[in-house]
């Protein structure tokens, strides 16, 4: 039995090691807004490539009447995108509330922004300095303080401000050791609400340009949630760009922009007043529910799902980006009608990478009574006391990863006594440019609790249209001889997604 279990595990490892490398997003600190344009994404592996190939084939052989919708009608049989043609734009300091039916793609939207889910089509623009709060709260073995600071340099004022905003002061004050009380592994056990508030505090404490809050108020009572939303999301983080996944009308009213998703598509994008004007029946239906915000999250989601489903069936079609823009937006024409394949598929693109590496996450996460995934540390600019970007101590451009990959492959061969040692797992990969972003220290006042390491505002467009042929000669590497490289971050992502 042990032998079969081992074989199963080895097969999973081998399967994982032969997967395409997960790429970290490039970032650029000049970008101040967050933009998503015409983004379509699939969770199913390989659909991105399939999407591209099928589209290319479709372009090569159009039907006699010139109808180019053939591919799309056939494609629906192959797989459904988790996000379809999503558009939004939020400026620095704005709050975008994302609501929608169950399984509409709200979390997937955040995954796309983080680079966990690569779009098969579309364009994303943001600085890349992200802090993420998962809907599944989690605690690492260590003190409360360590769980909140989580490797970021300690700033007492910011730390205590965050604790206060997340209403942890009272909880901590009950312990004799205060915030030095040890959690997990021999320490105390926290309630669900305490865990949720610590997870939120961890995300808020980290200095970032964009905060992704995925239903962060789990296990909190209505009053506490309302207070923390006010004190933390609205006040403490007032000058930060925030994307909040929520189902509360109160949050939608307070948000600068609202994105309502239904079955992967954008049902509505705009302000709350525009929602009332453009979708009066929909908004009145939800607001007509007595004490809608007092319901449990499950019930709110259920009502929202049922309402969206009914309005979709009744022909109250989702308000598209272009329709909404015509009716109510006075925005610059940044989003053209032409679909750009700007976050390019790795098969036929040149991707840029930052050589600033992410710190591997510890593996000893505490998961009390849940199968919650580990939150990945997305500190793309590692924090130091001086607030400068830290360069890795090894040469990233060296063959280090190659050697690591070969070593992993040889270990696998040894473990499996593989007869496929000559098997070609090498992949033709495009070249990549690597660049360093150094964030100068901004000398700001204490009014902004994040100002210690607030980076210079800067614009990276993750993804421009690049002619591969033009650049091939300039950036040619003989990648044939380099095996597939699997990083620790990819491994973490893999085990999180495939956790049984």
């Amino acid at each position: 039995q042990t032998w079969y279990d081992s074989l199963g595990a080895i097969n999973k490892i081998q399967d994982f090691l032969q997967k395409q490398e997960y790429k970290t997003l490039e970032y650029n600190l000049t970008t101040t807004e967050v933009v998503m344009e015409n983004v379509t994404a699939f969770w199913e592996e390989g659909f991105g490539e399939l999407f591209e190939k099928a589209k290319q084939n479709n372009n090569n052989r159009k039907t006699s009447n010139g109808d180019d919708s053939l591919f799309f009608s056939n494609f629906s049989l192959l797989g459904t995108p988790v996000l379809k043609d999503i558009n939004f734009k939020i400026e620095r300091g704005q709050l975008l509330a994302v609501a929608g039916s169950t399984g509409a793609g709200k979390t997937s939207l955040l995954m796309v922004i983080m680079g966990e889910l690569e779009p098969s089509e579309g364009k994303i623009k943001h600085s890349g300095r992200i802090s993420f709060c998962s809907q599944f709260s989690w605690i690492m073995p260590g003190t409360i303080k360590e769980n909140i600071i989580f490797g970021v340099s300690y700033d007492e004022y910011r730390y205590r401000s965050v604790i206060k905003a997340c209403q942890l002061e009272e909880d901590i004050s009950k312990f004799a050791e205060k915030d030095n009380i040890v959690l997990g592994e021999g320490g105390i056990t926290l309630s669900g609400g305490q865990r949720a508030r610590i997870s939120l505090a961890r995300a808020v404490y980290k200095d970032a340009d964009l905060y992704l809050l995925d239903s962060p108020f789990g296990y909190l009572d209505v009053l506490t949630e309302k207070e923390i939303f006010e004190s933390c999301v609205c006040k403490l983080m007032a000058n930060k760009t925030r994307i909040l996944v929520t189902s509360k009308m109160e949050h939608l009213k307070k948000a600068d922009k609202i994105l309502i998703l239904h079955e992967g598509s954008s049902y509505f994008y705009g302000t709350f007043s525009e929602l009332q004007n453009l979708q009066p029946d929909f908004s009145s239906k939800l607001m007509g529910c007595d004490s809608f915000d007092q319901f449990s999250a499950e019930r709110r989601n259920s009502i929202l799902t049922e309402t969206l489903h009914r309005f979709s069936l009744e022909g109250d079609a989702p308000v598209s980006w272009t329709e909404t823009k015509k009716q109510s937006f006075k925005q610059t024409g940044e989003f053209g009608e032409k679909r750009k394949n700007s976050i390019l598929n790795p098969i036929n693109s040149i991707r840029k990478f930052s050589i600033v590496q992410k710190t591997p996450l510890q593996m000893n996460g505490i998961e009390e009574d849940s199968d919650e995934p580990l939150e990945r540390r997305l500190s793309l600019v590692p924090d130091s006391e001086q607030g400068e970007a830290i360069l890795p101590r090894i040469s990233v451009i060296s063959t280090g990863p190659t050697l690591q990959a070969r070593r992993r492959q040889s270990v696998l061969n040894l473990m499996t006594h593989s007869v496929n040692q000559g098997q070609n797992i090498h992949r033709k990969t495009t070249a990549s440019t690597r660049k360093v972003s150094l964030a100068p220290q901004a000398n700001l006042t204490e009014l902004d609790i994040y100002s210690r390491r607030l980076s210079q505002e800067t614009g990276l467009e993750i993804s421009e249209e690049i002619n591969e042929e033009d650049l091939k000669e300039c950036f040619f590497d003989d990648m044939e001889s380099i095996p597939a490289v699997t990083t620790w971050n990819t491994y973490l992502r893999y085990i999180t997604v495939h956790k049984s």
């Epitope: 007492e156 004022y157 205590r160 401000s161 206060k164 002061e169 901590i172 205060k178 915030d179």
Partner: nanobody, 123 residues
Framework: QVQLQESGGGLVQAGGSLRLSCTAS????????MGWFRQAPGKEREFVAT????????DYADSVKGRFTISRDNAKNTVYLQMNSLKPEDTAVYYC????????????????WGQGTQVTVSS
């Protein structure tokens, strides 16, 4: 949870100096914001100075700025108030206080108080 004991008060001439100490019993001293308050006869208790948990942030009442200095030694569980250039109007009972709440000059926000030490400045 926390007991506070002040010391160092006494009679001093105007223009003179005194150093008040406040020792705390109990754990996690660095968690607490420590403050000094004073109460003159027939007057309200007023804020004098406060220092944050790791000493990185300090605040003073306008009337004592430049003359008084607050500091703390977390290893010794002690907070100090160095008073220079004392004036007769500084005469009062000086109280040490500890707050779990960051960051306040309001006496209402302080959870724990010492018994006080008398400071008298003669002209």
């Amino acid at each position: 949870q926390v007991q506070l004991q002040e010391s160092g008060g006494g009679l001093v001439q105007a223009g003179g100096s005194l150093r008040l100490s406040c020792t705390a019993s109990g754990r996690a001293f660095s968690w607490y914001v420590m403050g000094w308050f004073r109460q003159a006869p027939g007057k309200e208790r007023e804020f004098v100075a406060t220092v944050s948990g790791n000493g990185s942030r300090r605040d003073y009442a306008d009337s004592v700025k430049g003359r008084f200095t607050i500091s703390r030694d977390n290893a010794k569980n002690t907070v100090y108030l160095q008073m220079n250039s004392l004036k007769p109007e500084d005469t009062a009972v000086y109280y040490c206080a500890a707050s779990s709440t960051y960051y306040y000059t309001d006496p209402e926000k302080y959870d724990y108080w010492g018994q006080g030490t008398q400071v008298t400045v003669s002209s």
